[in-house]
Amino acid sequence: FNISGCSTKKLLWTYSTRSEEEFVLFCDLPEPQKSHFCHRNRLSPKQVPEHLPFMGSNDLSDVQWYQQPSNGDPLEDIRKSYPHIIQDKCTLHFLTPGVNNSGSYICRPKMIKSPYDVACCVKMILEVKPQTNASCEYSASHKQDLLLGSTGSISCPSLSCQSDAQSPAVTWYKNGKLLSVERSNRIVVDEVYDYHQGTYVCDYTQSDTVSSWTVRAVVQVRTIVGDTKLKPDILDPVEDTLEVELGKPLTISCKARFGFERVFNPVIKWYIKDSDLEWEVSVPEAKSIKSTLKDEIIERNIILEKVTQRDLRRKFVCFVQNSIGNTTQSVQLKEKRG
């Protein structure tokens, strides 16, 4: 299709080489109440279109994204050619940064309802550059945490080194929706709830004598509880003795609850104590059986192919540890009588 009638938007993505970050493009098709862009080249003000422009349908998932190759080849369907770019409804997610993401991206409705809709498209010229400005050493991260129940703020990474007074007007989006009241380089949250979690996008306009473009940054915001003050709890086994049958296989499960830690390095292992000796046992990998905002329950099993007389003299010890400390629970096997 002919893209010469598409509206054009220029965007700049300046990425930090020292952190993982994502980027998004919105399919900013004009909305009927804002403009009749999709029709303006076709209708005089006196003419009334038979139907509203595409965006009137509210179905933003029905858009098609293309990339325009720089060598003039035909448009390429994003989904077929670019595995690191994901389409989610009307948004294009770039999962990895890199100058190779630079280029022209076009979106338009999948359903062309009338000849007028042919020109209902947006061309986004994206320039991707690594961050070179070393003067701003403490720029805000693209991953920010908000502590539940307290006050917090979300900073626009590309503007976080500027004072509020110097900062240009910023347009914020949360999960693709415009946050119309937010215009500064920082969103202040009076009280953090779990719904504050999401993908935030901050845009501001930069210009030179020739043209203007939108500088965009994406912030992944996570709502968290404070780091735990507690050692992990061993939830299972609770009892320190276990009745077993000699010669039968046995699995002993150790389940432990670890409180939330931003830097999370849980340890859960089994070792055996036999008189003065103790050694760690090679057991199957630990697995997470429940994970919530404030904790994670991890399980690790010890498997005995056959319970022997020697096993009755041993202590099987589950050892769990986080940054606060460690907890152990030992189990002595006891032969089942009768």
Epitope: G149, S150, D236, R257, I297
Partner: antibody, heavy 126, light 111 residues
């Protein structure tokens, strides 16, 4: 911080509602809110706790069941309703936050009360 | 319901000395025990979680130990500021049971 209010001088048989208000944090699912009382010159006595706002998530000391009701009325307020008060209920009533409470396999695990209000005095007398 | 018994009811010791307070649970509570300090006219202050984990800001002179039914709080290098009443509290039990019981308290007098 936490602050209790509603303490008063009341007659035996009366009812009274105490309120605990939090500032600087909210009663999110991370926290369990509790009430403890202390009669003049005596030790601490646990009354009960609530840990996410519905009445069936409240649990009580055996002696408090039936006469005392804990409710979460907003994200920053918890109340203690007391009925059929007697002179033995004369005490300073404290609101406290348990740092970390959860249930697992029929057991409730708490951590300890890391934040307390200054207390409010309830006097039951003729 | 679990019953927490604290001994002694009162103890006197010199500045620089050591005090040991015992707490006994009527049934095993594993390591689910907290210790508090309360000074006259003030609310209690948590010192220790999980029988031995020190709350941040609490001096390492306070040491908690024990598991099952027998627990101990040891205060070494006693200071005048340690004069207070100390309480233990069970923090584990059957869901819905009356388990967050406090011990009767131990008054520490520092000479």
């Amino acid at each position: 911080s936490l602050e209790e209010s509603g303490g008063d001088l009341v007659k035996p048989g009366a009812s009274l509602t105490l309120t605990c208000t939090a500032s600087g944090f909210s009663f999110s699912s991370s926290y369990c809110m509790c009430w403890v009382r202390q009669a003049p010159g005596k030790g601490l006595e646990w009354i009960g706790c609530i840990y996410d706002g519905s009445s069936d998530s409240a649990y009580y000391a055996t002696w408090a069941k039936g006469r005392f009701t804990i409710s979460k009325t907003s994200s920053t307020t918890v109340t203690l309703q007391m009925t059929s008060l007697t002179a033995a209920d004369t005490a300073t009533y404290f609101c406290a936050r348990d740092y970390d409470t959860y249930d697992y396999d029929g057991y409730t695990y708490a951590a300890g009360f890391d934040l307390w209000g200054p207390g409010t005095l309830v006097t039951v007398s003729t | 319901d679990v019953v927490m018994t604290q001994t002694p009811a009162s103890v006197e010791a010199d500045v620089g000395g050591t005090v040991t307070i015992k707490c006994q649970a009527s049934q095993s509570i594993r390591s689910y025990l907290a210790w508090y300090q309360q000074k006259p006219g003030q609310p209690p202050k948590v010192l220790i979680y999980r029988a031995s984990t020190l709350e941040s800001g609490v001096p390492s002179r306070f040491k908690g130990s024990g598991s099952g039914t027998q627990f101990t709080l040891t205060i070494s290098d006693l200071e005048c500021a340690d004069a207070a009443t100390y309480y233990c509290q069970c923090t584990y039990g059957s869901s819905g049971s009356s388990f967050l019981a406090f011990g009767g308290g131990t008054e520490v007098v520092v000479k």
